[in-house]
């Protein structure tokens, strides 16, 4: 168990725990104090004791020992009185920290005393050697517990220069692979630096004497170190490994390192000392095996094999951990160690080896674990697990602390939990005690809640309630109990409505550049704070201040200017403080394809056959399959910036062989097309030019026609530059009179025309036009018939007659003209006609002429749209390319027709049963008017049928209708008549019903002069006439509200002028009908000094 921080009010003891201790190896130098450190925590206070070499050691009883008087410290310091006092205290120390709960133990602290370093006295003889031989200058420094550093210098304190030939070994010796006369010195001094004592001592100088020789003899390498052929080394895991090979020989050998057993770990290997030293960092198991050094020169080689065995000091696989236990639990301390060789593991309890304990103990040791079952407070102890092999020692202290604690609920009482329907609620009840208390949840009736399968308990005391329902709202009780006591808390649960997305966003496909709107509607519990946010591909979307990309408002997300990068999943997130629901929609952005990224020309040898192969990389389809690729070309020479399509290929194709034209400078591009249109084109290809060739086409649209009576102009459509097949093209024109079979006349021209002069009028010629370039002629051209120039026709069309079809159409016929008289190609006939006037009276207006062009193969025409009862003049002329010939003339008349509609029909109400109709005659009589036809019928279904009157007076302009129903609306229809019958009708709807009711003054207004006022109104169409009173009433104190006598006015008169008013006075105007007040308005007269005249055109009564 672990006592939670919140479990207060219980004073818990703590077993001892070592918090600080001296290192496992402590080297003390002559001038140093000895400090042995051991600190520990614990409650009650910890007592310390020491052992040296396994025997009880009492620091306080030793001379020169200072013990630290601190509750958590057993450390002490020994201060010496002479330089070798430390020798006396050498040994293996161990500290034990105890309180009533047990004893913790420190690791072994090996104390070593190092004396002042001295080189033993020795007589150093000179070293004599012949030039070219090898030599070793020994150093042999005194032994040291700490690593030391060796330097070779001369008497001037200058370092001896080291290189491939001269090297210092790891042992400090100076090796010469071969000596030179320049090595001859008497002061080779070895310096040893002891960092611990901060001292440097030096060996006696060595005198190296080199005898010169005339003939240096080459010799193959020999190893000076190591001297034998192989050696075995143990490397410690995690430590560095240093291998060394130093060779002699002449010329100076070079050193190489090999690993026959596997690859050299390049990331961890460094070569030093001119390759003589191999250092391998952080040795691992995989570094086990053979390493070889090879010393080589021009005469041969020498080698040494290092057999490396990787071993390891003990290390933890699983270190035992301290724990608190409640009564009755099983305690298990795992102590799993590894090492090479496999370490030996021993257990201690409270610092005493288990072998020395009484046999009736409860513990058992099983596969590296110490196990105690059914622990009780008396089983509290500190255990030690110790593992050792020849490379080291590993120690762990771990306590078993058995506590008895009353049950306590650590969750606050009377907490309120809120959750939504359908979700899971978690009511907390974190209880603690030793033994572990049992936890029970009860409802308000004290019944266990676990009868409902929706309620489920957790080991930590939490109660889960799944699939929450509204009626789960209420109070719940948690009861925690152990053998010492029991406690209860209450929890309130409130179940809220779940948030629901009632209408989520819909997946959609939109075009690039357009905008999309996603909508989202959600329902929330009214007591919760609602929120709707939007996410795009998992990241929150916000309106960005500097961009109008997103617009978010009222559950709407609008994304503007859609691009392909906007494609993805968009979700609406509806949330409250209790729940979150999400509805997702997919947006696909579609549009025309992306650019074709790459374009390559191949098979350029086919250019000689006017072909080439074009290949391209497929374009992005932007979610709409590519339907086709359009291959275009440009000729920068002939038509820069103009692209011509060479053809389209299916969208699944990415190459094609193109058929080209000779002598075109082709630059290609390819554009992908889908249903949304073409994409951006590819980058342009390189330019290729096809070889020249003779023309393959001749010009088309060859024509021969004169522009004068004595010539013929031969024209044709020039070849497009892409059909020239060469840098230039010319035209070979040939002609001869048709039917002569005589020789052809010919001319080669560059322009697209040729004028043949001195021809007879309108003679047919055979014509040929052929394309010619530097490579040859085009194919044999076709013969075209052309004609020399035309003259004006002399033929006059002979009229056959005119047939009157109806009052507004006639059929005109004539005989075909003599073609010989046409003097050219008969192009057709011009028919001109105009109205000379009505048969009623001839007008002197401007004459408008109409024209009809009739094709050459037609000799009749229908002239329609004529005015009835009118006289017309007619002319017919033949025409050719030169112009029109003489006209044949004729006049004709159209018969009477029916008239146009009468103009302006007005309805005037006479009474509630009678109406007066007023009208104007039609503009187009189309004959002699004989009168009018008036028809009317009620508009509603139940009215009487249609009534018609023939009004036989053509001069009639009004008609009074009586016996009308005041309750009905009528439809009135008036037609003028000629002898051909009634014409078009004018229609009005109305009646006396609406018009004779409450008076309507319409748009009524009043204006004023100095002593008068004019009231005017617009009588409503058809409104029955009536009479009413107008009363002017002066306002203001001095006027005394005086009224003028009311005046009687007729509705039809449109205005009324009131005289005798006071200047500069406000008047109220009242309108009465049958003593009923109908309307009121106000007016103010002008001040004096103006002309007293009423406005012109106003009637007064």
């Amino acid at each position: 168990i672990q006592i939670p921080e919140e479990y207060e009010g219980h004073h818990v003891m703590e077993p001892p725990v070592i918090t600080e201790q001296s290192p496992r190896r402590l080297v003390v130098f002559p001038t140093d104090d000895i400090s042995l450190k051991c600190e520990a925590s614990g409650k009650p206070e910890v007592q310390f004791r020491w052992t040296r070499d396994g025997v009880h050691f009492k620091p306080k009883e030793e001379l020169g020992v200072t013990v630290y008087q601190s509750p958590h410290s057993g450390s002490f310091t020994i201060t010496g009185n002479n330089s070798n006092f430390a020798q006396r205290f050498q040994g293996i120390y161990r500290c034990f920290a105890s309180n009533k709960l047990g004893t913790a133990m420190s690791h072994e602290i090996r104390l070593m005393a190092e004396g002042a370093p001295k080189w033993p006295k020795e007589t150093v003889k000179p070293v004599e050697v012949e030039e070219g031989e090898s030599v070793v200058l020994p150093c042999n420094p005194p032994p040291s517990a700490e690593p030391l550093r060796i330097y070779w210098m001369n008497s001037k304190i200058l370092h001896i220069k080291q290189d491939e030939r001269v090297t210092m070994g790891q042992n400090g010796n100076l090796y010469f692979a071969n000596v030179l006369t320049s090595d001859n010195h008497s002061d080779y001094i070895c310096h040893a630096h002891f960092p611990g004592t901060r001292t440097i001592i030096q060996k006696e100088p060595i005198d190296l004497r080199v005898k010169a020789t005339n003939s240096m003899i080459d010799r193959k390498p020999r190893l000076l170190f190591p001297t034998n052929s192989s050696s075995h080394l143990v490397a410690l895991q995690g430590q560095p490994l240093v291998l060394e090979c130093i060779a002699e020989g002449f010329p100076t050998p070079t050193i190489k390192w090999l690993r026959p057993s596997g690859p050299m770990p390049a990331d961890r290997v460094t070569y030093q000392n001119h390759n003589k030293t191999l250092q391998l960092l952080k040795v691992g198991e995989e570094d086990d095996g053979e390493y070889r050094c090879l010393a080589e020169n021009s005469l041969g080689s020498a080698r040494h094999a290092y057999y490396v065995t990787v071993e390891a000091a003990p290390y933890w696989l699983h270190k035992p951990q301290s724990h608190l236990y409640g009564p009755g639990e099983t305690a298990r301390l795992d102590c799993q160690v590894q090492g090479r060789p496999q370490p030996e593991v021993t257990w201690r309890i409270n610092g005493i080896p288990v072998e020395e304990l009484a046999k009736d103990q409860k513990y058992r040791i099983q596969r590296g674990a110490l196990i105690l079952s059914n622990v009780q407070p008396s089983d509290t102890m500190v255990t030690q697990c110790e593992a050792r092999n020849r490379h080291g020692l590993l120690l762990a202290n771990a306590y078993i602390y058995v506590v008895q604690l009353p049950a306590k609920i650590l969750t606050a009482d009377n907490q309120t939990y809120m959750a939504v329907q359908g979700s899971t609620a978690y009511l907390l009840c974190k209880a603690f005690g030793a033994p572990v208390p049992s936890v029970q949840w009860l409802d308000e009736d004290g019944t266990t809640v676990l009868q409902d399968e929706r309620f489920f308990p957790y080991a930590n005391g939490t109660l889960g309630i799944r699939d929450l329902q509204a009626n789960d709202t209420g109070r719940y009780f948690c009861l925690a109990a152990n053998d010492q006591n029991n406690v209860t808390i209450m929890a309130n649960l409130k179940v809220k409505d779940a948030t629901q997305i009632t209408q989520g966003p819909r997946s959609t496909i939109e075009k690039k550049g357009s905008r999309v709107t996603f909508t989202c509607q959600a329902s929330f519990d009214p007591s919760l704070q609602p929120s709707i946010t939007w996410r795009g591909d998992g990241r929150d979307l916000q309106e960005l201040g500097d961009s109008d990309k997103y617009f978010i408002e009222d559950g709407r997300l609008v994304i503007h200017s859609l691009d392909y990068s906007d494609q993805g999943n968009y979700s609406c997130v509806a949330s409250t403080e209790l729940d979150v629901v999400e509805s997702r929609a997919q947006l696909l952005v579609v549009g025309s394809p992306g650019p074709v990224p790459r374009l390559v020309l191949s098979d350029l040898h086919l250019l000689t056959q006017s072909q080439v192969r074009v290949s391209w990389s497929p374009a992005e389809d932007h979610n709409a399959p590519i339907e086709k690729y359009d291959i275009e070309f440009e000729d920068k020479e002939m038509a820069p910036e103009k692209w011509y399509s060479l053809g389209k290929v299916p969208g699944n194709q990415t190459s094609t062989t193109l058929k080209l034209s000779p002598y075109v400078h082709y630059t290609f591009r390819v554009t992908a097309i889908n249903k949304y249109g073409p994409g951006e084109p590819s980058p342009v290809s390189e330019t290729v030019v096809t070889p020249e060739a003779a023309p393959e086409k001749n010009p088309v649209d060859v024509k021969g026609e004169g522009n004068e009576t004595t010539n013929m102009v031969i024209t044709w459509k020039p070849l497009r530059w892409m059909d020239w097949n060469a840098p230039q093209v010319q035209y070979r024109v040939q002609w001869r009179p048709q039917g002569t079979r005589g020789p052809w006349q010919e001319q080669i021209v560059s322009d697209p025309f040729l004028v043949v002069s001195n021809t007879s009028t309108f003679v047919p010629y055979e014509i040929k036009v052929q394309a010619v370039n530097s490579q040859g002629k085009g194919p044999e051209p076709q013969v075209t018939i052309g004609y020399s120039g035309e003259d004006y026709p002399q033929a006059i069309p002979e009229l056959e007659g005119i047939e009157i079809l109806n009052s507004s159409a006639v059929l005109v016929k004539w005989r075909p003209v003599d073609l010989a008289q046409v003097k050219g190609h008969l192009r057709g006939y011009n028919v001109t006609y105009w109205r000379e006037g009505s048969q009623r009276k001839h007008s002197k207006r401007h004459i408008h002429k109409d024209h009809v062009v009739v094709p050459a193969n037609t000799t009749s025409v229908i002239l329609s749209g004529l005015r009835p009862y009118s006289s017309y003049h007619l002319e017919v002329q033949a025409f050719n390319g030169r112009g029109s010939g003489p006209a044949s003339e004729f006049t004709f008349s159209t018969p009477e027709g029916v008239p146009g509609h009468p103009e302006a029909l007005h309805l005037e109400c006479q009474s509630n049963t009678s109406l007066l109709l007023r009208w104007q005659p039609p503009l187009s009589h189309n004959g002699v008017l004989t009168g009018y036809v008036l028809s009317y019928h009620p508009l509603d279904e139940g009215g009487k049928g249609q009534l018609s009157f023939n009004l036989r007076d053509p001069e009639l302009r009004t008609h009074n209708l009586t016996d009308l129903s005041p309750h009905l609306r009528y439809r009135f229809q008036l037609q003028a008549t000629t002898k051909e019958g009634p014409g078009e009708a004018i229609v009005r709807e109305g009646g006396t019903m609406a018009l004779s009711g409450i008076s309507d003054f319409g748009n009524i207004s009043a204006t004023a002069g100095e002593n008068y006022s004019v009231v005017s109104w617009v009588p409503k169409e058809g409104q029955c006439n009536f009479r009413f009173h107008i009363l002017f009433k002066a306002l203001g104190e001095e006027k005394g509200g005086a009224s003028l006598s009311p005046q009687y006015v007729s509705y039809n008169q449109s205005s009324y002028t009131q005289w005798d008013l006071q200047p500069d006075t406000d008047y109220e105007i009242h309108l009465f009908k049958e003593r009923m007040f109908r309307h009121q308005m106000a007016v103010k007269t002008n001040g004096t000094g103006r002309v007293r005249l009423p406005p012109a055109g106003f009637a007064t009564e």
């Epitope: 390559v600 020309l601 191949s602 098979d603 350029l604 040898h605 086919l606 250019l607 000689t608 056959q609 920068k636 400078h665 980058p683 342009v684 390189e686 330019t687 290729v688 030019v689 070889p691």
Partner: antibody, heavy 119, light 107 residues
Framework: QVQLVQSGAEVKKPGSSVKVSCKAS????????IQWVRQAPGQGLEWMGY????????DYAQKFQGRVTITADESTSTAYMELSSLRSEDTAVYYC????????????WGQGTTVTVSS | DIQMTQSPSSLSASVGDRVTITCRAS??????VAWYQQKPGKVPKLLIY???TLHSGVPSRFSGSGSGTDFTLTISSLQPEDVATYFC?????????FGGGTKVEIK
């Protein structure tokens, strides 16, 4: 008259990069593609790639893909060839050449730039 | 890639001799072959394209022939100024490839 003038000789370490320039004059720079060809000592010619100076579109021989970059600056009528991750076998004379207008031939050449790669 | 194999790699001839250099393509290249001349210390110069078309300014003693895979460059009468290395090049397909060169010397 048409001229292509290249930058001077370079000595480079393996693994480094070299950038050779080629300044064109005497014609409209954007009308003709620039190709790059190299010639190792005593060896034949090897095509490396091209650039279209009017669109800056470039393409390279598969062998050099990922190591070579050909660029152009219209304002100075200059093309550039950069070769990275140099190895000793990249020691060569590097030529820029103008592509003939109608065919992938080389009608005008730069004087060549010697690039030596050595440690 | 299309390989271009040139032979011989070098030749020595006297002034006035007729000299023939051949070039073989590893696949059909039609007549999309060009020949270049590179004088010692100089840049290559275009001589012939479309296998047989003489580039402007090239003396008429140079001629080319062949189609498909076998091509020939002929110098009808060798002159001292013709001492150079001659390269063939195919331009049917990318990458553009060159022959190894033929060094022509005067005896």
């Amino acid at each position: 008259q048409v001229q292509l003038v290249q930058s001077g000789a370079e000595v480079k370490k393996p693994g480094s990069s070299v950038k050779v320039s080629c300044k064109a004059s005497g014609y409209t720079f954007t009308n003709y593609w620039i190709q790059w060809v190299r010639q190792a000592p005593g060896q034949g010619l090897e095509w490396m790639g091209y650039i279209n100076p009017s669109t800056y579109y470039s393409d390279y021989a598969q062998k050099f893909q990922g190591r070579v970059t050909i660029t152009a600056d219209e304002s100075t009528s200059t093309a550039y060839m950069e070769l990275s991750s140099l190895r000793s076998e990249d020691t060569a004379v590097y030529y820029c050449a103008r592509r003939q207008f109608g065919l992938p031939l080389f009608d005008y050449w730069g004087q060549g730039t010697t690039v030596t790669v050595s440690s | 890639d299309i390989q271009m194999t040139q032979s011989p790699s070098s030749l020595s001839a006297s002034v006035g001799d007729r000299v023939t250099i051949t070039c073989r393509a590893s696949q059909d290249v039609g007549t999309a072959v060009a020949w270049y001349q590179q004088k010692p210390g100089k840049v290559p110069k275009l001589l012939i394209y479309w296998a047989s078309t003489l580039h402007s300014g090239v003396p008429s003693r140079f001629s080319g022939s062949g189609s498909g895979t076998d091509f020939t460059l002929t110098i009808s009468s060798l002159q001292p100024e013709d001492v150079a290395t001659y390269f063939c090049q195919q331009y049917s397909n990318y990458p553009l490839t060159f022959g190894g060169g033929t060094k022509v010397e005067i005896k």
